[in-house]
Amino acid sequence: SGTTNTVAAYNLTWKSTNFKTILEWEPKPINQVYTVQISTKSGDWKSKCFYTADTECDLTDEIVKDVKQTYLARVFSYPAGHVESTGSTEEPPYENSPEFTPYLETNLGQPTIQSFEQVGTKVNVTVQDEWTLVRRNDTFLSLRDVFGKDLIYTLYYWKSSSSGKKTAKTNTNEFLIDVDKGENYCFSVQAVIPSRRTANRKSTDSPVECMGHEKGESRE
């Protein structure tokens, strides 16, 4: 079983949002298949996505075991129809991925405003806590559980009648802001990990929610 005419994978790229993590690569296979291996710096290689014709592999199950570890993956190329042979000594071509540390590098998914409630001149805005596939003691953890106080939310809020956006911040999932009585306001939130120094510090903005629509309620 040779590895003639197989092309090594290239452009290995981690795509990760809220710890859902997929390794992508090129090229689209012609007469070849791929197997992916992943390991921590000090660990053993574990094979995933055996002999796949896809150019991506979901590695979430592996990286959620310890999101603060640094992982390395590699993609092996085999001829199509390849069957594992115990007698084969020739190592198939492979390419290494960049290192990936989920806690530092996973992108923050778009947040959602769960609700807002007005009481007089105060509005309480609640951000939905997203669930992740990270587990502790067989329980799935939320984004807040994983990041704790490292994660903050920035609230942008503005009168429906004006364009200037005021800001508020919280390291919980709740905001309590002052508003003018009788005015309708709109809200959008952004997740931020201030300790990060890279382009993935911030999420995209949540959808805008405005008072006078179904998510909010008002009490005097």
Epitope: I152, Y156, T167, V192, P194, R201, D205
Partner: antibody, heavy 120, light 107 residues
Framework: EVQLVESGGGLVQPGGSLRLSCAAS????????IHWVRQAPGKGPEWVGY????????YYADSVKGRFTISADTSKNTAYLQMNSLRAEDTAVYYC?????????????WGQGTLVTVSS | DIQMTQSPSSLSASVGDRVTITCRAS??????VAWYQQKPGKAPKLLIY???FLYSGVPSRFSGSRSGTDFTLTISSLQPEDFATYYC?????????FGQGTKVEIK
Amino acid sequence: EVQLVESGGGLVQPGGSLRLSCAASGFTISSYIIHWVRQAPGKGPEWVGYIDPSNGYTYYADSVKGRFTISADTSKNTAYLQMNSLRAEDTAVYYCARDPQTLTSPFDYWGQGTLVTVSS
Amino acid sequence: DIQMTQSPSSLSASVGDRVTITCRASQDVNTAVAWYQQKPGKAPKLLIYSASFLYSGVPSRFSGSRSGTDFTLTISSLQPEDFATYYCQQHYTTPPTFGQGTKVEIK
């Protein structure tokens, strides 16, 4: 190294316009918030406004609302302050500053400032 | 808008003196107060953030504290390079606002 460099200041007549630039290096402006702050001669700093370059959101001090506009070009990693209908009381050194969007968000880096003089 | 009332507006002190500057917020600003140092012709420099946290690279003779809406900047032993103007700033709500400044001069 994080750096902010303002440019575009100068002498302008009352009612005139000027555009200031704030060129950032060592970080990506779309990951932060950029503020403009001014300081009149012998006075304390006065906040002018901010932009979040990731979404274009802005807010302005009442003293400049309707006359000043903040924008950003993320491809150039630069923020701008367009100043129209300038008045004598707008004379000041104008600084841009970075807001790290932490819980209490101090301005952790400032430019060196550019002087705007409004006089006939 | 939240007013930040800073006092004194100026003070004279000698090298080695303990110097205290205070700032009072017109309403609750939690711990969202920063202190800056400014020298003539230069931009302000961050010293203290979140009321009491020393910014990276700032000498430990600078400290900050909070009591309700009162905030204090203390220089434990004034050094020649500390003669400058100091400003407090709140960033709890938009717009952020600055105190009027305290000029620390040589006695």
